[in-house]
Interface confidence: low
């Protein structure tokens, strides 16, 4: 999986009038990294991990860059003629990647009201657009606007490609290692519930990447979906993720239940603690 930096900018119009605010979210290697909103942009690192990657001297630079990009996108939205009444959004997603063989990829995508209408490969400068007439109209609109400023057309997108890769390399050199795989810590806890039932909860934390399977099994067989309750897979602020799954079981039958976890090709099972032992911790390697 390549290292990646992804910028997601959104600007809005209301009844044809472009709003002064914008929202930018930056993801580094798929992790929420920076967030910048409204016209008083604050490049807010998303957790301690992001703080560590950025270092304390880069905030002003990130804020300035993101604010400039937001203004550019607002100008682009103002030139879209298809402004109907109500709330509309223009979204620009810019992605650059560095692969393990050191090859690079960069692309840029425009969405209007959530619908993709224009893409560009920032290395080859090749534009693509969906076949729908609405998308084609929007795409021509935006491309014409971008071409109005010849200098911008010639330099802006090359700069976006170069800057994105430069920023990505800078982040990767920050000294905070973005590890490919971090195994989860799995905790199983129990809490007393009513009428002879207990609730058992299996928590996985500190893992990367985010893809994980966590479920309860009875006698080795997965419980049905509707008897389990899942938490979302959420960033924990350290560049890793956390999640949980819970179910209700009859007291005395704890030994029949196990939590099954699968992550990055490794899997393990974790029993329910019995008696007065409330937490069982196991960290597989």
């Amino acid at each position: 999986e390549p290292h990646s930096l992804r910028y997601n900018l959104t600007v809005l119009s209301w009844d044809g009038s472009v709003q002064s605010g914008f929202l930018t979210e930056v993801h580094l290697d798929g992790q929420p990294f920076l967030r910048c909103d409204r016209q008083k942009c604050r490049a807010k690192p998303q957790g301690q991990w992001a703080e560590d990657v950025l270092g304390n001297k880069t905030w002003d630079r990130e804020t300035r860059d993101l604010t400039g990009n937001g203004k550019d996108l607002r100008m682009t939205l103002a030139h879209i003629k298809d402004q109907k009444e109500g709330l509309h959004s223009l979204q620009e997603i810019r992605v650059c990647e560095i692969h393990e063989d050191n090859s690079t990829r960069s692309s840029q995508h425009f969405y209007y009201d959530g619908e993709l209408f224009l893409s560009q490969n920032l290395e080859t400068k090749e534009w693509t657009m969906p076949q729908s007439s609405r998308a084609q109209t929007l795409a021509m609109n935006v491309r014409n606007f971008l071409k109005e400023d010849a200098m911008k057309t010639k330099t802006h997108y090359h700069a976006m490609h170069a800057d994105c890769l430069q920023e990505l390399r800078r982040y990767l050199k920050s000294g905070v290692v973005l590890r490919r795989t971090v195994p989860p810590m799995v905790n199983v806890t129990r809490s007393e519930a009513s009428e002879g039932n207990i609730t058992v909860t299996c928590r996985a934390s500190g893992f990367y990447p985010w893809n994980i399977t966590l479920s309860w099994r009875q006698d080795g067989v997965s419980l049905s979906h509707d008897t389990q309750q899942w938490g979302d897979v959420l960033p924990d602020g350290n560049g890793t993720y956390q999640t949980w799954v819970a179910t209700r079981i009859c007291q005395g039958e704890e030994q029949r239940f196990t939590c099954y976890m699968e992550h990055s090709g490794n899997h393990s099972t974790h029993p329910v603690p019995s008696g007065k032992v409330l937490v069982l911790q196991s960290h597989w390697q």
């Epitope: 959104t10 605010g21 929202l23 409204r38 604050r42 959420l234």
Partner: antibody
């Protein structure tokens, strides 16, 4: 036009569960963080929970953490609030709200939840 | 959680008066503050976002100022439709919090 419409409010007994829905129309629902805000009778506004536009991040007020679950179905333009282990102090009008990004300029009309034995 | 304290809790004023409501945050929130107006039985209405930016369609007699921990909502010349309850709200960090409200009544 831009609209949020809540439903699912009811009178329930303490300890029971209830699920609220919020249907969105007139804007690109999947682009927006959506929040639940509540207001107890005669009281002020209290923020309850938020779910990010893509459903990845969720945050809750301490008063509902562990009992309420916020979720969304972007394919249906609908927001949900699953309320478990309800208490008398959860009695309120529940609003869904949104805006670009966190100051709410889009509000639903509210749905009343009464928790009483 | 960041606490917001509004003052006064209630105030009486007359049409044409200049009115100021303050909101103090328990810690710095930059300019991440919004103001809302709510009339009895109605949905809250956004007036100001980012401490000083006027929402679209809101009359220019409403203005907001402040940064960090101290914020102000000012109504330059009260109109009959302005009598309502006003709330401040911080969106600097989760959990989002509201002030307790300021009730503005006719004198």
């Amino acid at each position: 036009q831009v609209q949020l419409v809540e439903s699912g409010g009811d009178v329930v007994q303490p300890g029971r569960s209830l699920r609220l829905s919020c249907a969105a129309s007139g804007f690109t629902f999947s682009n927006y963080n959506i929040h639940w805000v509540r207001q107890a009778p005669g009281k002020g506004l209290e923020w309850v929970a938020v779910i990010r536009y893509d459903g990845i991040n969720k945050y809750y007020a301490d008063s509902v953490k562990g009992r309420f679950i916020i979720s969304r179905d972007n394919s249906k333009n609908t927001l949900y609030l699953q309320m478990n282990s309800l208490r008398a102090e959860d009695t309120a009008v529940y609003y869904c709200a949104s805006g670009p990004p966190d100051a709410f300029n889009i509000w639903g009309q509210g749905t009343m939840v009464t928790v009483s034995s | 959680a960041i606490q917001l304290t509004q003052s006064p809790s209630s105030l009486s004023a007359s049409v044409g008066d200049r009115v100021t409501i303050t909101c103090r945050a328990s810690q710095g929130i930059s300019s991440a503050l919004a103001w809302y107006q709510q009339k009895p039985g109605k949905v809250p209405k956004s007036l100001i976002y980012d401490a000083s930016s006027l929402e679209s369609g809101v009359p220019s007699r409403f203005s907001g100022s402040g940064s960090g921990t101290d914020f102000t909502l000012t109504i330059s010349s009260l109109q009959p439709e302005d009598f309502a309850t006003y709330y401040c709200q911080q969106f600097n960090s989760y959990p989002i919090t509201f002030g307790q409200g300021t009730r503005l009544e006719i004198k």
